[in-house]
């Protein structure tokens, strides 16, 4: 009796259970009682990751400069290429078909993580004895000055946004 | 259904070329099988000749030396033999196969 | 190239008898695939070869199930469970794993 299912990395076609392509191969021609499934690799910019039954191979990612993009990792015959964003720029979303700009943290606000090619920079509120006075991608909240350990005094207290003026102590006359 | 049937002389003289085709219907000879030539001498053993495949490209018995050619005509959907510089021990029934469907055969004398 | 050897040659079989045909290759009809291209045929007086097995024990479509196909690597056999009168023909093994194909010379099988 013809199959009605076949073995792992095998398909049914017309009675007839035939190998399927390794990755980095499509397929030529199926099987038949007398021939194996015949295979021809993907030509420079295609690939195919998985064992199948394709005609056709997939291209390779482009990753366009215009969009803000970069290879990270060129393609195989096996993989897809790999796009990250260019310094500066992340990716919009998983797939990274194109990047936007870092976003900065404002004053009062300081960068927990800094931003890669794939992730955003993530901003935290200065906590109180913190602050940030500038927009940047980078900068982190700094600690208010300490005017005790410069034998000085607060005359202005700091905030989230601003440090605090150390000032000469009173003297006792 | 599958079909397949020979065409040629059934008489050629020693030294000339022979000729045949075998007209395929109910398949397209642009699909994956391979398309063979198969002979049998009179009250003898079958003979694998050669094959061409869905793609043109194809492989010979190198018993036929460099006698033997099997060339496509997609357009009619047959494909053909020649063969060169006979001799009366090329006196056979010619098949032309898929090998699970076969023409009917037709007889070509070698002699002058 | 790959020689197959058929045994016996003669096979006189009384009607409703089991009948076997053995088949030997001089090297194995295994591919790197794990696929072994051994055919049976079956050639009635008059009349062109009829696939019978394929892949050394696949059926083909229409063949009645008293025929069966076993073996492996260099040794195969061809099994009728019950012969009947129109059994009766040349039966011939091919292998297509390796090229040039080649046949087997052929067991005659004939009523007692």
């Known amino acids: 009796e013809p199959p009605t299912a076949c073995r792992e990395k095998q398909y049914l076609i017309n009675s007839q259970c035939c190998s399927l392509c390794q990755p980095g191969q499509k397929l030529v021609s199926d099987c038949t009682e007398f021939t194996e499934t015949e295979c021809l690799p993907c030509s420079e910019s295609e690939f195919l990751d998985t064992w199948n039954r394709e005609t056709r191979c997939h291209q390779h990612k482009y990753c366009d400069p215009n969009l803000g993009l970069r290879v990270q990792q060129k393609g195989t015959s096996e993989t897809d290429t790999i796009c990250t964003c260019e310094e500066g720029l992340h990716c919009m979303s998983e797939s990274c078909e194109s990047c936007v700009p870092h976003r900065s943290c404002l004053p009062g606000f300081g960068v927990k993580q800094i931003a890669t090619g794939v992730s955003d920079t993530i901003c935290e509120p200065c906590p109180v004895g913190f602050f940030s006075n500038v927009s940047s991608a980078f900068e982190k909240c700094r600690p208010w000055t300490s005017c005790e350990t410069k034998d000085l005094v607060v005359q202005q207290a700091g905030t989230n946004k601003t440090d605090v003026v150390c000032g000469p102590q009173d003297r006792q006359r | 259904q599958v079909q397949l049937q020979e065409s040629g002389p059934g008489l050629v003289k020693p030294s000339d070329t022979l000729s045949l085709t075998c007209a395929v219907s109910g398949y397209s000879i642009t699909t994956n099988y391979y398309w063979n030539w198969i002979r049998q001498p009179p009250g003898n053993k079958l003979e694998w000749m050669g094959y061409?495949?869905?793609?043109?490209?194809?492989n010979y018995n190198p018993s036929l030396k460099n006698r033997i050619t099997i060339s496509v005509d997609t357009s009619k959907n047959q494909f053909s033999l020649k063969l060169s510089s006979v001799t009366a021990v090329d006196t056979a029934v010619y098949y032309c196969a898929r090998l699970d469907y076969w023409g009917q055969g037709t007889l070509v004398t070698v002699s002058s | 190239d790959v020689v197959l050897t058929q045994s016996p040659l003669s096979l006189p079989v009384t009607l409703g008898q089991p009948a076997s045909i053995s088949c030997r290759s001089s090297?194995?009809?295994?591919?790197?695939?794990?696929?072994?291209?051994l055919n049976w045929f079956q050639q009635r007086p008059g009349q062109s070869p009829r696939l019978l097995i394929y892949?050394?024990?696949n059926r083909f479509s229409g063949v009645p199930d008293r025929f069966s196909g076993s073996g492996s690597g260099t040794d195969f056999t061809l099994k009728i469970s019950r012969v009947e009168a129109e059994d009766v023909g040349v039966y011939y093994c091919?292998?297509?794993?390796?090229?040039?194909?080649?046949f087997g010379q052929g067991t005659k099988l004939e009523i007692k």
């Open positions: 091919l292998q297509v794993t390796h090229v040039p194909f080649t």
């Open positions: 892949k050394v024990s």
């Open positions: 090297q194995s009809l295994e591919n790197s695939n794990g696929n072994t291209f």
């Open positions: 061409i495949k869905y793609d043109g490209s194809n």
